[in-house]
Interface confidence: medium
């Protein structure tokens, strides 16, 4: 295996440009040996690096052995010689994390990048007056996304003191004593909690304790999902993965595949049915976005898909990223509407629960008043809404969602770009003319998309009289997967919206729904209703139905307002 073979298989100029290192396997035609594309004294080629590049951002990373950057921007470095860099700084006021590309030949913050060839970003402390300053550099795929402060410290390593001594020195012994006591107490608490958790798994109880706030614990008897929610909103950092057996593929999206799966009980043949959303390694960013959204305990809501845990799994195909959630056998709303005609009562329940889910997502507090980060979905559509057994909605697929963090700058918001599904994009998104000064603008785009989904529901409601086959919004005007340009023609140029036939308005309830959704798809974002307002309107509809003593589909509603659905 020498030059002759290489020359025969490769264009000559590539052979000349590459350093001949070990042999090429005989079955590999035109294969680049891993040592070949390098920048070295021999003058071979180096390709630019992919790095996290968010410049300086505020960070919550503190006293951890490693942190994720939480930077959503991956950039291909401008110059081939550049590597990924992360800088962590802490002073009296705040903690910041900087992620950039930088040429290791040049100093950064007055320091030489000594570890530029490392595949991992392992932080080293640098002397800077008035602040704690750590820096790392590395050269592998987005390696500055995971910054490591201590490689020696392993969660199973009891020798914590040794590591702390190395970092802080003996002068910190008194506060260390207190810290270690706290760690031991916390550890005992976690072990105890873990034992309780696993016993909950074994019993498979569906009784749910949701701690909304210290003074607000609500127990819900919930038969809508198999999942024991005690485990919800956890990230599975354990090396031991949940005993899950994938069953059938139930959905496939842009970024991931969704499987129905069996979560086995420790002691028996019993299992709980769960959904597993599997992201390939390339879609790490989508998985992380969704995981970060779900990990917020304050997101918990009956109209938002119940999250169990997130896992990183190694398979023969390479690394995969899993999200494990409740499973809803009725599938997504689009599938459900395609297969079923719905009653007025169904429409009211589906519409009301959808609005409540979005209102909770958008809200800056929980139902109990605890502060919560508002979130915008940015890809609301009928295929991203699941139908629960009681015929209420729950929102799913948060891969494009955005936390409306008050620290986000206008530039950050601008960088989030034109995302979503063209068919459901609001006019201002299609036109890329959102008011980034006002975070409410993002919520208003969700409300537009919600209006189209409400229209889809209404179009399949038998209370309007004649019901046509299911058609998505603008179904007769655009092809199956319309592009932004064709949606611009319909929504912007023609000011088009899905048709509301006049006979729909003969039904008083549907007339009110149509008035509501018309206000929600207004061309002017400021004129649209809020999701909370829509939820309140649906509550009024329910109240009116109760007062009238019957639903308009001639189903009696008991005086107490409880609904008997035998579907």
């Amino acid at each position: 295996m020498g030059r002759g073979l290489l020359r025969g298989l490769w264009p000559l100029h590539i052979v000349l440009w590459t350093r001949i290192a070990s042999t090429i396997p005989p079955h590999v035609q035109k294969s680049v040996n891993n040592d070949m594309i390098v920048t070295d004294n021999n003058g071979a080629v180096k390709f630019p690096q992919l790095c996290k590049f968010c410049d300086v951002r505020f960070s919550t990373c503190d006293n951890q052995k490693s942190c994720m950057s939480n930077c959503s921007i991956t950039s291909i470095c401008e110059k081939p010689q550049e590597v990924c860099v992360a800088v962590w700084r802490k002073n009296d006021e705040n903690i910041t994390l900087e992620t950039v590309c930088h040429d290791p030949k040049l100093p950064y913050h007055d320091f030489i990048l000594e570890d530029a060839a490392s595949p991992k970003c392992i932080m080293k402390e640098k002397k800077k007056p008035g602040e704690t300053f750590f820096m790392c550099s590395c050269s592998s795929d987005e390696c500055n996304d995971n910054i490591i402060f201590s490689e020696e410290y392993n969660t199973s390593n009891p020798d914590l003191l040794l590591v702390i001594f190395q970092v802080t020195g003996i002068s910190l012994l008194p506060p260390l004593g207190v810290a270690i006591s706290v760690i031991i107490i916390f550890y005992c608490y976690r072990v105890n909690r873990q034992q309780k958790l696993s016993s909950t798994w074994e019993t498979g109880k569906t009784r749910k304790l949701m701690e909304f706030s210290e003074h607000c614990a609500i127990i819900l008897e919930d038969d809508r999902s198999d999942i024991s929610s005690t485990c919800a909103n956890n990230i599975n950092h354990n090396t031991e993965l949940l005993p899950i057996e994938l069953d059938t593929l139930v959905g496939k999206g842009r970024f991931a595949e969704v499987y129905k799966a069996k979560l086995k009980q420790n002691t028996s043949e019993q299992f709980e049915t769960v959904a597993v959303k599997i992201f390939p390694y390339e879609e790490y960013a989508s998985w992380k976005t969704e995981k970060d959204i779900f990990s917020d305990i304050n997101l918990k809501h009956e109209n938002i898909l119940q999250f169990l845990t997130a896992e990183e799994r190694k398979t023969e195909l390479g690394k995969q990223y899993w999200l494990i959630t409740a499973f809803h056998a009725k599938g997504n709303l689009q599938e459900y509407l395609t297969r079923h005609v719905i009653s007025w009562e169904d429409l009211r329940k589906l519409g009301s629960s959808l609005a409540r889910g979005i209102a909770h997502l958008h809200s800056d507090h929980t139902p109990c008043g605890r502060p919560k980060m508002p979130i915008v979905h940015r890809d609301l559509k009928s295929s991203n809404i699941l139908v629960k057994n009681d015929l209420t909605c729950c929102l799913c697929d948060f891969g494009l969602s955005l936390r409306l963090d008050p620290t986000l700058s206008v530039d950050d918001l601008a960088n989030s770009g034109q995302v979503g599904t063209a068919r459901y994009m609001a006019p201002e998104v299609l036109e890329s003319r959102m008011n980034l000064e006002n975070v409410e603008s993002f919520k208003q785009t969700d409300v537009y998309s919600m209006a189209l989904v409400l229209w889809e529901m209404t179009s399949r409601c038998n209370a309007v009289g004649e019901v046509k086959d299911y058609e998505p919004p603008f179904g007769s005007k655009v092809r199956e997967h319309p592009c932004v340009e064709s949606m611009k023609d319909n929504v912007l140029r023609d000011r088009g919206r899905p048709e509301i036939p006049s006979f729909w308005l003969n039904h008083q309830g549907i007339q009110m729904v149509c008035e509501t959704l018309t206000e929600c798809w207004d061309h002017d974002p400021e004129a649209r209703l809020t999701a909370q307002c829509v939820a309140e309107r649906f509550s009024e509809l329910e109240h009116l139905d109760r007062l009238s003593g019957r639903s308009c589909s001639e189903e009696k509603i008991p005086e107490d307002g409880s609904l008997n659905t035998t579907k």
């Epitope: 680049v32 891993n34 070949m36 594309i37 291909i76 590597v83 050269s139 390939p280």
Partner: nanobody
């Protein structure tokens, strides 16, 4: 056997357009980030553009931003490069390349397979 076969190159006038294709076989196309890389006469290799396997996120070198568009058709196992507003400095042999799987690669070793290239000449 892994194969990458480029086509679509040729002679074009400045300001003109070309569309390059790269037919891939012998591996699961939907699992890999794919790249276009070029080499101008007498110069080093230069990356042009990259595309993620699913979700179709794209990356471009500054020199081609706004003029070139990378895309892929996973159902046809084909990678494309639409080149508009071509300039003399775009003259090069264009290669499509498959990225090493997973996160095993570094900037020093990014690809495990290349095509044999297609020549694009921009001249009046």
């Amino acid at each position: 056997e892994v194969q990458l076969l480029e086509s679509g190159g040729g002679l074009v006038q400045p300001g003109g357009s070309l569309r390059l294709s790269c037919a891939a076989s012998g591996f699961t196309f939907t699992e890999y980030r794919m790249w276009w890389v070029r080499q101008a006469p007498g110069k080093g290799l230069e990356w042009v553009s990259a595309i993620e396997p699913i979700g179709n996120r794209t990356y471009y070198a500054d020199s081609v931003k706004g003029r070139f568009t990378i895309s892929r058709d996973n159902s046809k196992n084909t990678l494309y490069l639409q080149m508009n507003s071509l300039r003399a400095e775009d003259t090069a042999v264009y290669y499509c390349a498959k990225q090493i799987p997973g996160r095993k690669w570094t900037a020093n070793s990014r690809f495990d397979y290349w095509g044999q290239g297609t020549l694009v000449t921009v001249s009046s």
